[in-house]
């Protein structure tokens, strides 16, 4: 009997009520592997969740968060409010980044501006709530006697907020 069931492809189940015939998964269910005795019910993307990928007979639905929110956790298991760039989400809602910190995304926390002097560089472009500082050549490189043939160091890419 197991051999008969192993022939049932994804999208079907091995129907014990019909002599191990491979029956299609009923509506709103799926089987992602062959040889299944039952089909799994599809996930519903309702409430704060919206459908990113419809359920098919061979794969489950995938959910996303409704507009203004972003997914947290495996399989988008929770939705968290978006904030604007230059803000972070606190228990009291979205708050502007404090001076000296920035957030270039709609999620995550405000992070300190890069300290250019730690790399022996100077600030080329000041930081804002939405953007990190851009570090340029070291102050010594900008002195009158310094050669101008060497191109300045490339601007540091702002990092990504923790997900």
């Amino acid at each position: 009997l197991q051999d008969l069931c192993s022939n049932c492809p994804a999208g079907t189940f091995c129907d014990n009520n019909r002599s191990q015939i491979c029956s299609p998964c009923p509506p709103n269910s799926f089987s992602s592997a062959g040889g299944q005795r039952t089909c799994d019910i599809c996930r519903q993307c309702k409430g704060v969740f919206k459908t990113r990928k419809e359920c098919s007979s061979t794969s489950n639905a995938e959910c996303d968060c409704i507009s203004g929110y972003h997914c947290l956790g495996a399989e988008c298991s929770m939705c968290e409010q978006d904030c604007k760039q230059g803000q972070e989400l606190t228990k009291k809602g979205c708050k502007d980044c404090c001076f000296g910190t920035f957030n270039d995304q709609k999620r995550g926390i405000c992070r300190p501006w890069t300290n250019c002097s730690l790399d022996g560089k100077s600030v080329l472009v000041n930081g804002t709530k939405e953007r990190d500082v851009v570090c340029g050549p070291s102050p010594a490189d900008l002195s009158p006697g310094a050669s101008s043939a060497t191109p300045p160091a490339p601007a540091r890419e702002p990092g990504h907020s923790p997900q």
Epitope: D40, G47, V48, G73, E80, K92
Partner: antibody, heavy 115, light 107 residues
């Protein structure tokens, strides 16, 4: 800190209408789904239903259309009405924020239905 | 609807010991499961979502695992404040449903 504060009549007679309101303080109101959950004395939790600020709702089929939700975005409040109550509706009723799971809850209101 | 079954109904554990609570779904719910803690006279508090992700401010001694139909909440070393009732809840499908709860009591 998001806080949910709820109130409503605590003692009802059979066939009357249960009416509860929940106010949301701190944090955003619009965009979230807001739910009602109940817990009969000494028993487990039962989801009643949910509403979003736009007025869209969903409810538990077990309540057979006895339930009505409403929302007042100007006050950051949402409400529950359950008509034709019986003793089986005696429970602590909670409001909660729905973000997938229920991440913030009201303090609960005991509603007793007795003749 | 998806039926959630918790076991045992009551778990007697000594402080400092490990507690393991089980939750079973009547159908596969992937990892779309939450755990809550409820103390007498209080509202439930979210502990875990997505079967294994701790909610904000929840101590590391709480951990969740499982996928499909079998789930576990583990409290690695019980503190006095952990004696309470614990509920699992699926939000994979509507209506949203809870398990019957497991009471963790002092041995």
């Amino acid at each position: 800190q998001v806080q949910l504060q709820q109130w409503g009549a605590g003692l009802l007679k059979p066939s009357e209408t249960l009416s509860l309101t929940c106010a949301v303080y701190g944090g955003s109101f619009s965009g979230y789904y807001w739910s009602w959950i109940r817990q009969p004395p000494g028993k487990g939790l039962e989801w009643i239903g949910e509403i979003i600020h736009s007025g869209s709702t969903d409810s538990n089929p077990s309540l057979k259309g006895r339930v009505t939700f409403s929302v007042d975005t100007s006050k950051n409040q949402f409400s529950l009405k359950l008509n034709s109550v019986t003793a089986a509706d005696t429970a602590v009723y909670y409001c909660a924020r729905l973000t997938g799971p229920f991440d913030y809850w009201g303090q609960g209101t005991l509603v007793t239905v007795s003749s | 609807e998806i039926v959630m079954t918790q076991s045992p109904a009551t778990l007697s554990v000594s402080p400092g010991e490990r507690a393991t609570l089980s939750c079973r779904a009547s159908q596969s719910i992937s990892s779309i499961l939450a755990w809550y803690q409820q103390k007498p006279g209080q509202a439930p508090r979210l502990l875990i979502y997505g079967a294994s992700t701790r909610a904000t401010g929840i101590p590391a001694r709480f951990s969740g695992s499982g996928s499909g139909t079998e789930f576990t909440l583990t409290i690695s070393s019980l503190q006095s404040e952990d004696f309470a009732v614990y509920y699992c809840q699926q939000y994979y499908n509507w209506p949203l449903t809870f398990g019957g709860g497991t009471k963790v009591e002092i041995k």
